[in-house]
């Protein structure tokens, strides 16, 4: 058998390499598709998704979509290829280590989406950038 480090490259997007031919490890993401949520008016929420999946393609990142309409609130957690739009939107923040929610214009509902590229990063969805950037250790130093 020929190990992967000497295999000729094949036309298959299950294998992703950088410029030096290194293989990319796949992302681990929360993947519960669409579920009802109680997350509302909070700076951050946990997904409450118990399924962590190995993303099928190594280029995929973690995505979370929060939607609120007159009837309910849902949270969607998936893997997705950032080269492709999701819900008709580009994943602009796919390289971020944290899932920082950004509002998108959708008629008839409030729609937030985030994407990120660290393991299970779509488990903790953050609606406040201030919440994300504040450093508790720094505050401790300031107030001492």
């Amino acid at each position: 058998t020929i190990p992967p480090h000497v295999q000729k490259s094949v036309n298959n997007d299950m294998i992703v390499t950088d410029n030096n031919g290194a293989v990319k490890f796949p992302q681990l993401c929360k993947f519960c598709d669409v579920r009802f949520s109680t997350c509302d008016n909070q700076k951050s929420c946990m997904s409450n998704c118990s399924i962590t999946s190995i993303c099928e393609k190594p280029q995929e990142v973690c995505v979370a979509v929060w939607r609120k309409n007159d009837e309910n609130i849902t949270l969607e957690t998936v893997c997705h290829d950032p080269k492709l739009p999701y819900h008709d939107f580009i994943l602009e923040d796919a390289a971020s280590p944290k899932c920082i929610m950004k509002e998108k214009k959708k008629p008839g509902e409030t729609f937030f989406m985030c994407s990120c590229s660290s393991d299970e990063c779509n488990d903790n969805i953050i609606f406040s950038e201030e919440y994300n950037t504040s450093n508790p250790d720094l505050l401790l130093v300031i107030f001492q």
Epitope: P3, P4, H5, V6, Q7, T17, D18, N20, G21, A22, V23, K24, F25, L28, I54
Partner: nanobody, 124 residues
Framework: EVQLLESGGGLVQPGGSLRLSCAAS???????RMWWVRQAPGKGLEWVS?????????YYADSVKGRFTISRDNSKNTLYLQMNSLRAEDTAVYYC?????????????????WGQGTLVTVSS
């Protein structure tokens, strides 16, 4: 430097079982997330399953969920893959690989990160 050596592959009938092992030489086995990766003839790599070093939390590709079980014995520096209800589409060379915390890429030439592979053939 850790070297990885897989064993346990072979020919098995559809519906049968196999247990793969991956022995790691070296003392840093417990620092790494370990993976089973497979490559079918003419196809790309498929990341089958992973297991954390501490707590032994496990992850599976949808294609093997409910059929394959990954485990590790840190005292023996060994990774395992129990494969049940095998199908023809599970035919591949199976590799073990290791991933350090926050590591996103692994060089294909790094023999200390990849095993040489063991061939699993599922056929009647």
């Amino acid at each position: 430097e850790v070297q990885l050596l897989e064993s346990g592959g072979g020919l098995v009938q559809p519906g049968g079982s196999l247990r793969l092992s991956c022995a790691a030489s070296g003392s840093t086995f417990t620092e790494y997330r370990m993976w089973w990766v497979r490559q079918a003839p003419g196809k790309g790599l498929e990341w089958v399953s992973a297991i954390e070093p501490i707590g032994h939390r496990t992850y599976y590709a949808d294609s093997v969920k409910g059929r394959f079980t990954i485990s590790r014995d840190n005292s023996k520096n060994t990774l395992y893959l129990q494969m049940n209800s095998l199908r023809a589409e599970d035919t591949a060379v199976y590799y073990c690989a290791k991933q350090a915390p926050n590591q996103r890429y692994v060089a294909r030439g790094r023999l200390d990160y990849w095993g040489q592979g063991t061939l699993v053939t599922v056929s009647s």
